[in-house]
């Protein structure tokens, strides 16, 4: 299924932050990826190709992100308990056609050991 729960490890914790992995099929050339927390857009990244196959990357809601040929990673820092929620990767495929939207997601559990600046 291309929709539904992520069938891969979506959350990777390090240094009091989390990397949220949003995968897309590697044939996808042009797309928009949004990271949703509940129903709210936290971050987005749009990849388009212009004439001469020049690649353009744009963000309207900027987060620290990283693009590979089959995933976008969004990074959230200074984790606290308020970050616990459902997170969704909302992918809009523009190329190759036809247009398609897919949603995959999972619940981010926050445990004490993953918090940023615990008091010892």
């Amino acid at each position: 299924e291309i929709n539904g729960s992520a069938n891969y490890e979506m959350f990777i914790f390090h240094n009091g932050g989390v990397q949220i992995l949003c995968k897309y099929p590697d044939i996808v050339q042009q797309f928009k990826m949004q990271l949703l927390k509940g129903g709210q857009i936290l971050c987005d990244l749009t990849k388009t190709k212009g004439s001469g196959n020049t690649v353009s990357i744009k963000s309207l809601k900027f987060c620290h992100s990283q693009l590979s040929n089959n995933s976008v990673s969004f990074f959230l820092y200074n984790l606290d308990h308020s970050h616990a929620n459902y997170y969704f990767c909302n992918l809009s495929i523009f190329d190759p056609p036809p247009f398609k939207v897919t949603l995959t997601g999972g619940y981010l559990h926050i445990y004490e050991s993953q918090l940023c600046c615990q008091l010892k």
Epitope: V28, P96, P97, P98, F99, T102
Partner: antibody
Framework: QVQLQQPGAELVRPGASVKLSCKAS????????INWVKQRPGQGLEWIGN????????NYNQMFKDKATLTVDKSSNTAYMQLTSPTSEDSAVYYC?????????????????WGQGTTLTVSS | QAVVTQESALTTSPGETVTLTCRSS?????????ANWVQEKPDHLFTGLIG???NRAPGVPARFSGSLIGDKAALTITGAQTEDEAIYFC?????????FGGGTKLTVL
């Protein structure tokens, strides 16, 4: 081998909705888009819309948005197109065709396999 | 909505090379339109020939090839045969929808 099977003909009364079928075999049905195309006698081809069987995501030609509804039954590998309130303008041959785009397999981006078409006659 | 235009009819002779073209009302056809060529023979027999501008479908003879020529998509039949007599439709993708040309009736005399 890949096949898209459609009934040869359907007769429907004006105003009574009709559901056309397209049974797929010989490939992973849920992994490829199915398109529907209309051909009126002596005229060209009109794209109606498409559906991705895995999650039933659809796109429609605006001209058919209120006329056609695309669905699938994954258990029987069958795509359907329902036409509401048909009139004589809807009398035509309707084809289903596979768009060779899979998000998981090799891609060559062609409308490779076509059904033989269903001739729909709207008449009282 | 975009309009896709093809020659209405062409005539060729066996063994000759013939090129059919496909023009978009929105400007130059590009690889992002994923141009398709489909053959229609009598009794509603449709066969996909070319997709993604220049990918030949399995089982399609090598004499059929697709390309971009100038601002148009093109289907070239190199060494036409009598069985190539048919109607040829091109189709272009515009993001989330597909537009067909009016078709070219090819006669091989």
């Amino acid at each position: 081998q890949v096949q898209l099977q459609q009934p040869g003909a359907e007769l429907v009364r004006p105003g009574a909705s009709v559901k056309l079928s397209c049974k797929a075999s010989g490939y992973s049905f849920t992994s490829y888009w199915i398109n529907w195309v209309k051909q009126r006698p002596g005229q060209g081809l009109e794209w109606i819309g498409n559906i991705y069987p895995s999650d039933s995501y659809t796109n429609y030609n605006q001209m058919f948005k209120d006329k056609a509804t695309l669905t699938v039954d994954k258990s029987s590998n069958t795509a359907y197109m329902q036409l509401t309130s048909p009139t004589s303008e809807d009398s035509a041959v309707y084809y289903c065709t596979r768009w060779n785009l899979s998000y998981y397999f090799d891609n060559n981006y062609y409308l490779d396999y076509w059904g033989q078409g269903t001739t729909l006659t709207v008449s009282s | 909505q975009a309009v896709v235009t093809q020659e209405s009819a062409l005539t060729t002779s066996p063994g000759e090379t013939v090129t059919l073209t496909c023009r978009s009302s929105t400007g130059a056809v590009t690889t992002s339109n994923y141009a398709n060529w489909v053959q229609e023979k009598p009794d509603h027999l449709f066969t996909g020939l070319i997709g993604g501008t220049n990918n030949r479908a399995p089982g399609v003879p090598a004499r059929f090839s697709g390309s971009l020529i100038g601002d148009k998509a093109a289907l070239t039949i190199t060494g036409a045969q009598t069985e190539d007599e048919a109607i040829y439709f091109c189709a272009l993708w515009y993001n989330n929808h597909l537009v067909f040309g009016g078709g070219t009736k090819l006669t091989v005399l």
